[in-house]
Interface confidence: low
């Protein structure tokens, strides 16, 4: 049997809307059906309808169609809100431009190019003709509207009311002329619904003929209305999936607006000397990455091929080889001129000072008594007296109630990272407040530095699983996947928690991420039996400046021979110099010659003072950093990925002592790597694990 074409893409959908007729003379037809697609097919074909169908409403509750010979622009009709209704209007009747020759144009223009009023199609005065509405069914020869029933060159036309001029074309613009976009069209929300070759776009809320992941409900901010061209994924210009089963997608022909200005809301604040936010507005001339390697020109494809070209990203100022952030990354970056290092962050560019004139605290802020009552993410703090039970759960002394007034930011638990407060949000039980340490304050925040050196290892012996010592396996190693591809490493520190780096999250949509556990090969080859694939349910950002993220898994990992957790060090501990450590990572470069196997590089711990000397004094390390150098001259860059661990062993116990983050690099001879010191953040990690709810297995 012949497959009936799906015509719902020819309609503009208005959710939760119906049409009410004020004029009782207007006809309406109803019928019970299962889907809106069935309503659309009947409306398009006008089958069994005593009128030309211009719109319909699908009543989801009653599973019923209401077909109308009018639309929301008709007189005698008004729009009304209704949860169970979806209004679909035939786009041909509401469009004020033409596609191609305008054969499908059904708008209401009735004046010719030179301004003459059109003659009604049903009239023979002043011009006799054979274009009778009855002879051209479906061509909508209504009233005196411009039409192109035969699809002739020149577009819609009409017989004119001037006896001297038999017919003339009407001046109806091409939709591709009416529609315009700024930059690469990421903010385009126009009504173009066909591709540059004229193929009709597939509705975003449909999965036929092409299955795809861009579901409107999943991406509410991407403007996935009906089947209009959009640019949700940073392409050079808007595109859509097509109704042609053989052409999955195509770009749309949307011209750039004459005055190529962006809405004020889209414009990042332009800066030249420092970075505001993620630096999307940075327009300075820094042209090396953090370690001095020069940037590759954006308009060059050597040594790295890419599509981040000035032509593709018109408003992102991809001039010369300057650091930029065209894609919403963590901060400005560039491709490098080193063939072995594809990209690097320009983390040497300072942040624009946001904190001047604000509150500040000394030490760890335990004596802070200011009246800020908002977290760094903008949540309002909740009253301390409502949260005392929770507070008692993670501190083992009686807090000073006199300090815990109202809902002000405080530090009752001696948190090393400053004042915080509880929130009313069950997903984010508490968070730090946006207060900086007072300028010039050098009070150490690790309160036990005067005590004897604390060992990093807890005193328990190595755990053994099924007789296999876990130190022979790397089951805690996590491959973080972004849109199906490996992006970063991470460490499983608890069944539901992965420790990684904040630079690993280019998108804020958690559905873009997965965690792969139990694998040795980055593509999972040969790891089918042991691999666990888990969704990500939450990201908890570390204290300001930490570059850490705790990633909560949607369900706990199952610990077995292939998946295990790795221990955390004691808070504030010191590991002796020359301790042998390793960094792990898939070292993924995106090159086709990459074998995909997990790599390890052996390093040894180096004191901060010595480390600074090795970096020719260019870097000053603080208490939140740990340094490790390559064991022998000639050993290349460590193979780690961002987010991956620096793992050390003490008293036969393996621990994650560091996290690889961009901007400090890995170890090359005489240039030791600088990692985030996990021991400095151990209390924060424990506090998150203790206070954030996780799903039960």
């Amino acid at each position: 049997q012949r497959k009936r074409r799906n015509t719902i893409h020819e309609f503009k959908k208005s959710a939760k809307t119906t049409l009410i007729k004020i004029d009782p003379a207007l006809k309406i037809k109803t019928k019970k059906v299962n889907t809106a697609d069935q309503c659309a097919n009947r409306c398009t074909r006008n089958k069994g309808l005593p009128f030309t169908c211009k719109a319909f409403v699908f009543d989801k509750a009653r599973k019923q169609c209401l077909w109308f010979p009018f639309n929301s622009m008709s007189s005698g009709v008004k729009k009304e809100f209704g949860h169970e209704f979806d209004l679909y209007e035939n786009k041909d009747y509401i469009r004020n431009c033409i596609i191609g020759k305008g054969r499908s144009y059904k708008g209401t223009v009735s004046i010719t190019k030179s301004g003459i009023k059109c003659q009604p199609w049903s009239s023979m005065i002043p011009h006799e003709h054979s274009f009778l509405p009855s002879s051209y069914r479906g061509k909508d020869l209504q009233e005196n509207y411009c039409r192109n029933p035969r699809g002739e060159e020149g577009g819609p036309w009409c017989f004119t009311s001037n006896p001297e001029v038999r017919y003339e074309v009407c001046d109806i613009p091409q939709c591709s002329e009416v529609e315009c976009m700024t930059c690469n069209g990421e903010s385009y929300r126009g009504l173009m619904d066909h591709t540059e070759s004229g193929k009709i776009c597939q509705r975003w809320d449909h999965q036929t003929p092409h299955r795809h992941k861009f579901l409107p409900e999943r991406y509410p901010d991407k403007g996935f209305d009906d089947n209009y061209c959009r640019n949700p994924d940073g392409q050079p210009r808007p595109w859509c999936y097509t109704l042609d089963p053989h052409t999955r997608w195509e770009y749309c022909a949307i011209k750039t607006c004459a005055d190529n200005t962006m809405n004020d809301t889209d414009v990042p604040l332009e800066t030249t000397e420092c970075i505001q936010g993620q630096g999307e507005g940075y327009r300075g001339t820094v042209n090396t990455i953090w370690n001095g390697i020069p940037c590759q020109r954006w308009d060059s494809q050597y040594p790295h091929e890419h599509d981040m070209t000035p032509e593709n990203f018109k408003c992102k100022d991809l001039r010369e080889n300057y650091c930029r952030n065209p894609d919403g990354s963590e901060s400005p970056w560039c491709f490098t001129t080193d063939p072995n290092i594809r990209v690097g962050y320009c983390s040497q560019i300072p942040n624009c000072d946001m904190s001047h004139g604000q509150d500040c605290y000394r030490g760890n802020g335990k004596n802070y008594m200011g009246n800020l009552s908002q977290t760094r993410s903008g949540l309002t703090c909740s009253m301390w007296d409502k949260n005392m039970e929770d507070l008692h759960r993670h501190i083992f002394w009686e807090p000073d109630a006199s300090k815990l007034n109202e809902n002000y930011c405080r530090n009752p638990d001696d948190d090393a990272h400053g004042p915080w407060c509880y929130t009313g949000n069950p997903l984010i039980p508490w968070d730090y407040c946006p207060i900086s340490r007072c300028e010039g304050d050098t009070t150490p925040t690790i309160v036990n530095l005067d005590h004897p050196v604390i060992s990093c290892a807890k005193t328990k012996q190595l755990r053994v699983v099924n007789g296999i010592p876990t130190r022979t396996n790397i089951g805690w190693m996590v491959s973080l996947r972004y849109r199906n591809k490996h992006i970063c490493g991470g460490s499983l520190i608890k069944e539901s928690w992965v420790l990684t780096a904040r630079q690993c999250f280019p998108s804020r949509d958690l559905k873009d991420y997965e965690a792969w556990l139990g694998i040795h090969d980055v593509h999972g080859r040969g790891d089918e039996k042991c691999k666990q694939v888990l969704n990500v349910s939450q990201l908890v950002y570390g204290p300001e400046g930490s570059d850490l993220v705790l990633m909560k898994l949607a369900r706990p990992a199952v610990l077995d021979d292939f998946v295990s957790t790795i221990d955390l060090p004691n808070y504030g501990c010191t590991i002796p110099e020359k301790t042998s450590c390793s960094v792990y990572g898939w070292g993924y470069t995106g090159l086709i010659n990459y074998d995909g196997l997990l790599r390890v590089a052996h390093l040894y711990i180096m004191g901060n003072e010595k480390c600074s000397q090795h970096h020719r004094g260019k870097v000053t390390l603080n208490e939140s950093e740990i340094c490790a150098g390559a064991e022998k001259i000639g050993s290349g860059p460590c193979e780690g990925d961002y987010g991956g661990p620096l793992v050390c062993e003490q008293h036969k116990m393996r621990m994650v002592l560091g996290v690889i983050v961009p901007g400090r690099g890995c170890a090359i001879p005489n240039r030791p790597g600088i990692f985030v010191r996990v021991a400095y953040y151990a209390k924060w990690i424990h506090k998150i694990i203790l206070t954030y709810k996780v799903p039960q297995s």
């Epitope: 070759s197 795809h212 999955r248 997608w249 770009y251 494809q301 091929e305 890419h306 599509d307 199906n484 591809k485 593509h523 999972g524 080859r525 040969g526 089918e528 086709i592 010659n593 990459y594 074998d595 995909g596």
Partner: antibody, heavy 118, light 112 residues
Framework: SVEESGGRLVTPGTPLTLTCTVS????????MGWVRQAPGKGLEYIGM?????RAWYATWAKGRFTISKTSPTVDLKITSPTTEDTATYFC????????????????WGQGTLVTVSS | QVLTQTPSPVSAAVGGTVTINCQGS????????FSWYQQKPGQPPKLLIY???TLASGVPSRFKGSGSGTQFTLTISGVQCADAATYYC?????????????FGGGTEVVVK
């Protein structure tokens, strides 16, 4: 559509360039590949050219073939043909990344026959 | 990397079922980076299945792909005369400094 041309009888050692002309395919969006088939034999992958103009080759084909493109054509140069290079050479489009990350040839030309004989 | 197709040739009656196997000498670059093509005499190959089991556009649902790792299968159920052709499997492997694309030797399907 995809159409190959340039196949003919050549003597061993005489360089030969085959041309693949595409229509309705934007070479800045699609990678293209070359595959050959000796008479009565199976298919053999030669190499591909990416959207940015970088060419990749099968291990055995490195140095023996050169792939280049200037829209709307993709060329395959057989640098020094031998009798083993007698085959029908197909040009094929690689399916785009929004469909799959794998190398899949979804649109093929009819092929052009190259005969190498002294 | 070698892809071995079995059996060849294979014959089936109209309406019957044909199963073609393809065995790889090593695991794929990606678990499911595997395709099947159909080629009729004098014609170029035609894509049937990609990603091991995804049906290409316009291909009848009687063609089904399955498998992962090193072992893959193409099943044609309700065989029709038009299915008489040679079928090739294709996998994508890592080798040296390139991703190797390898084709199987082909399996001829004869329809009786």
């Amino acid at each position: 559509s995809v159409e190959e041309s340039g196949g003919r009888l050549v003597t061993p050692g005489t360089p030969l360039t085959l041309t693949c002309t595409v229509s309705g395919i934007d070479l800045s969006n699609y990678a293209m590949g070359w595959v050959r088939q000796a008479p009565g034999k199976g298919l053999e992958y030669i190499g591909m050219i990416g959207v940015n103009g970088r060419a990749w080759y099968a291990t055995w084909a490195k140095g023996r073939f050169t792939i280049s493109k200037t829209s709307p054509t993709v060329d395959l140069k057989i640098t020094s043909p031998t009798t083993e290079d007698t085959a029908t050479y197909f040009c094929a489009r690689l399916i785009d990344e929004r469909s799959t990350y794998s190398y899949v040839f979804d649109l093929w030309g009819q092929g052009t026959l190259v005969t190498v004989s002294s | 990397q070698v892809l071995t197709q079995t059996p060849s040739p294979v014959s089936a009656a109209v309406g019957g079922t044909v199963t073609i196997n393809c065995q790889g000498s090593q695991s794929l670059y990606n678990n499911n980076a595997f395709s099947w093509y159909q080629q009729k005499p004098g014609q170029p190959p035609k894509l049937l299945i990609y990603d091991a089991s995804t049906l290409a556009s316009g291909v009848p649902s009687r063609f089904k792909g399955s498998g992962s790792g090193t072992q893959f299968t193409l099943t044609i159920s309700g065989v029709q005369c038009a299915d008489a052709a040679t079928y090739y499997c294709q996998g994508e492997f890592s080798c040296g400094d390139v991703d190797c694309i390898a084709f199987g030797g082909g399996t001829e399907v004869v329809v009786k």
